[in-house]
């Protein structure tokens, strides 16, 4: 049914879905704090621009009796139930913030006439790609895939002189929501990653992973997994690892590597960690003070969602344009806005762009160091450390297939 939007006459409302199932187990109070902090900033920015308007948020809570698992895998209907609640109350804002679970976002997008913009902190899966009115403020799986393909093909760096075309992917089904969809994308036979690789096998059992580490007949030296160092240690322990094995540990939303006193454990020496570059300023606002590094990114995405709405509202009001139009709903993409922690860029499909950082462990200092950075906006890799102190032979990354030496400068498709 057509729901009237509280979105005109100088009063603009944001509908925030507060769902029991969420991409990160974050207390809803922290998300509320993030939203409220964002509102304060937006009000200040609009006032500074001479726009005398009211901006508020309405928090829509789902029925905890029905949807109380807290698990994204069971979230398919929760978003729709919340939309029904909004519809019954005849109370829809100019923009919808939340949901964060891929299943619920996909279902909501499918089953509703979205004439308003939807901003998500999450929705990582490929099924939420290329949605015309959906904006995602945490790196989706597509961005990870493009990095991996770019890095695999790279063969002209001092520390990587071989193109790679093979990989194992470790995926045991217990992953967090972000990891679940990242690995799902790598596993999908129709995905860009699968298309570009000659060989890819998914390891689903701990023992499969452990056996590969010293298997002379392995088909690839490269293993991709997703999670933190502790997750890797549980799996790998102190087992011996063949000298030309490279583990790529995807751990995007974890700032712990960038704490000054962190020393890399010994089991990380064969590992390259892919994470996001920390912001230029440390968050010390009320909502982030007590958050773990991962959850800070999640709460920050909510806050930035509010700032993004404020940015678009300001532009449309200054141009004298109507907010409750398809034009507004489709405008939340291909732009840069001032986020809480610096400029935030959205690509042509409304997905956040970021700088990914690939870290290695220095054998000299046992500290994490930046090997290279990758700009998702331009799909380009920038080497930082031209002479890394790797554990691998000659301080170069090995070939992905043992004994395939002579082909090292060829691209494999």
């Amino acid at each position: 049914s057509q729901v009237s939007q509280n979105c005109h006459n100088g009063s603009y409302e944001i509908s925030v879905l507060m769902m029991g199932n969420s991409a990160f187990a974050e207390p809803l109070k922290n998300l509320e704090d993030a939203v409220n902090e964002g509102l304060e900033i937006v009000r200040g920015r609009l006032q500074n621009a001479g726009l005398n308007v009211t901006v508020n948020a309405t928090f829509m809570y789902s029925d905890g009796l029905i949807h109380n698992s807290g698990d994204c895998r069971s979230s398919t209907c929760e978003g729709l139930d919340l939309l029904r609640k909004i519809s019954n109350a005849q109370r829809m804002g100019c923009v919808l913030i939340g949901p964060s679970c891929t299943y619920s976002t996909f279902q909501m997008y499918l089953d509703t006439e979205l004439s308003y913009p939807m901003i998500s902190a999450g929705s990582f899966g490929l099924s939420c790609d290329y949605k015309e009115t959906l904006t995602r403020l945490m790196s989706p799986a597509r961005k990870l895939m493009y990095f991996l393909v770019n890095f695999w093909k790279t063969n002209d760096l001092p520390f990587k002189t071989y193109s790679w075309s093979t990989s194992y992917v470790y995926k045991n089904g217990t992953e967090t929501e972000d990891c679940f969809w990242y690995l799902n994308a790598l596993e999908a036979s129709v995905s860009y990653f699968s298309h570009e690789l000659g060989f890819k096998v998914v390891l689903r059992q701990d023992k499969e992973f452990q056996d590969i580490l010293m298997d002379h007949n392995r088909k690839s030296n490269v293993i991709i997994m997703c999670g933190g160092p502790e997750f890797l240690y549980k799996l790998k322990g102190d087992r011996a690892v063949a000298e030309d094995i490279v583990i790529i540990l995807v751990d995007l939303f974890n700032d712990q590597y960038f704490e000054d006193n962190v020393t890399a454990p010994d089991y990380m020496k064969n590992v390259l960690v892919l994470t996001l570059s920390p912001g230029n300023s440390l968050l010390n606002s009320s909502f982030s003070r007590n958050l773990s590094p991962t959850k800070r990114d999640f709460a920050l995405a909510y806050l930035n969602g509010i700032l993004l709405f404020g940015h678009m509202l300001k532009i449309f009001l200054e141009n004298g344009e109507n907010i409750t139009t398809p034009k507004f709903a489709h405008a939340f993409r291909n732009l840069t806005f001032e986020g809480y922690d610096g400029p935030v860029t959205l690509d042509d499909w409304g997905d956040v762009d970021s700088t990914m950082v690939l870290l290695y462990t220095s054998v000299d200092t046992k500290k994490y160091k930046v090997l290279l950075t990758y700009d998702t906006h331009v799909n380009k890799t920038y080497p930082v450390d031209m002479s890394p102190t790797f554990t691998w032979k000659n301080s170069k990354l090995p070939n992905d297939i043992t004994g395939r030496g002579p082909q090292h400068h060829h691209h494999h498709h």
């Epitope: 000054d260 500290k367 160091k369």
Partner: nanobody, 123 residues
Framework: EVQLVESGGGLVQPGGSLRLSCAAS????????IGWFRQAPGKEREGVIC???????KYADSVKGRFTISRDNAKNTLYLQMNSLRAEDTAVYYC?????????????????WGQGTMVTVSS
């Protein structure tokens, strides 16, 4: 004696590229945070880019996406790759080093400075 020597400056057309080098002696670059600064004629000196001792690059908004920084510890040299150069990039470029207190943040001030290299962007 601690020394930083910049090179690679010159005249380049708008849209062109240059690669500046900063060779260090008397200390190991790897242990230091390194910054590139520039001073245009009649203007204040401004920070362009910094590489923390952990290797994290931080850019001024004006050069993001155009300039990149890298370090070769084997040669004890830092590089600044400048692409898509504009007239407003014309300046003397200095490199500076600071014994790092934080591995991931740029220092508030730098202890050692090079003598600078001139970059002119003009058609």
């Amino acid at each position: 004696e601690v020394q930083l020597v910049e090179s690679g400056g010159g005249l380049v057309q708008p849209g062109g590229s240059l690669r500046l080098s900063c060779a260090a002696s008397g200390f190991t670059l790897d242990d230091y945070a390194i910054g590139w600064f520039r001073q245009a004629p009649g203007k204040e000196r401004e920070g362009v880019i910094c590489l923390t001792s952990g290797g994290l690059p931080k850019y001024a908004d004006s050069v993001k996406g155009r300039f990149t920084i890298s370090r070769d510890n084997a040669k004890n040299t830092l590089y600044l790759q400048m692409n898509s150069l504009r007239a407003e990039d014309t300046a003397v470029y200095y490199c500076a080093a600071s014994g790092a207190t934080s591995r991931w943040n740029c220092p508030p001030q730098y202890d050692h400075w090079g003598q600078g290299t001139m970059v002119t962007v003009s058609s």
